[in-house]
């Protein structure tokens, strides 16, 4: 079982390989000096049907380096970064993992593209392995909370409360959504 020629790449090169390309072979892409690689650099020759070989993912692309590009902090609810740090320049990558009791959908790594957006795929999502969710927490008078979604929240996530200037937070600042579908504490209050 073997794979066909790896997909070509513009403004880059492919690592050496011999033919036929055996299942299990890895080929690596790189870009010319003034270009940046966007996407996974390694492709693996696999077989899904034990008859034909196929490449396990699409080839990356080489983008002309844009020194003015910069990408925003990527946020994955229920996940955290295991690689990558700000500032995010063209060609930089960020890799995510999911918190305990969350499973990942999508590709764990994304790249900062010339258009200031993360790609070539969407940010991964971390999905709670528990069907239970915590109900939406209320806003508090003279204060705010960090929850981005107004609907229910998956176990493992947390909400942080803060008070407006001149008010004091009484109670728990951070409230966690437990695997039972209940909140770890009642919302705090903001008092003068």
């Amino acid at each position: 079982i073997s794979c066909g020629s790896p997909p070509p790449i513009l403004n880059g090169r492919i690592s050496y390989y011999s033919t036929p390309i055996a299942v299990g072979t890895v080929i690596r892409y790189s870009c010319s000096g003034t270009f940046r690689l966007i996407g996974e650099k390694s492709l693996l020759c696999i077989t899904k049907d034990k008859v034909d070989g196929t490449w396990d993912k699409p080839a990356p692309k080489c983008e002309y380096f844009n020194k003015y590009s910069s990408c925003p902090e990527p946020i994955v609810p229920g996940g955290y970064k295991i690689r990558g740090s700000t500032p995010y320049r063209h060609g930089d990558s960020v890799t995510f993992a999911c918190k305990t009791n969350f499973s990942m959908n999508g590709n764990k790594s994304v790249w900062c593209q010339a258009n200031n957006m993360w790609g070539p795929t969407r940010l991964p999502t971390c999905v709670s392995v528990f069907p239970l969710e915590c109900p939406a927490l209320p806003m508090i008078h003279n204060g705010h909370h960090t929850s981005e979604n107004v609907g229910s929240i998956a176990p493992g996530l947390s909400v942080t409360y803060s008070c407006e200037s001149g008010y004091l937070l009484v109670g728990e600042k951070i409230i966690n959504c437990l695997s039972s579908g209940k909140w770890s504490a009642v919302p705090p209050t903001c008092e003068e």
Epitope: R13, G24, R28, S42
Partner: antibody, heavy 119, light 106 residues
Amino acid sequence: QVQLVQSGAEVKKPGSSVKVSCKASGGTFSSYAISWVRQAPGQGLEWMGRIIPILGIANYAQKFQGRVTITADKSTSTAYMELSSLRSEDTAVYYCAREDDSSGYYQDWGQGTLVTVSS
Amino acid sequence: EIVMTQSPATLSVSPGERATLSCRAGQSINSYLAWYQQKPGQAPRLLIYDASTRATGIPARFSGSGSGTEFTLTISSLQSEDFAVYYCQQYEYWYTFGQGTKLEIK
């Protein structure tokens, strides 16, 4: 970090076979590749082959083709290397090493297994 | 098979001084090169990958450079724990190691 724990030292007769195990803990066993690298006494490192457990695919260095078999048991997160038709030149420390995401380099290594081939 | 050649075979340097180790590939390997450190009775430890990226937890005194066929590992100020054998490894086409450079105390 992934921990790789190998089986103990072996003494074998020429012509026989040896099977060395490498148990992984931490990380997702099926998502990385395990290579076997050997080192004869006072010598350098020599790549023998590798397996990608999730695919069950093994590839071997030409020098060892036909004499080495690398397998993996996903249920126990264990990789195995069997070397047959042993000769005295096969006396070496055998290491398993982990490669993440087809990176090509080895972040984690087993402690090594000394295989002595002697009559 | 891509042949990797390291030089010198043995390098004698005093603690606090700079050490420069070389690795040459038999054909271009782009930047697909790793460096390992090995001490007696221990498994190798990854120092550098992709020719110049330090692995997690590796001190800043270790640096790698080069691309194509010529590569260098530099240890800026040698500590007592740095005296060991160093191996380069290519991963452009499967995997091969250099024969090693022994770094000893002068």
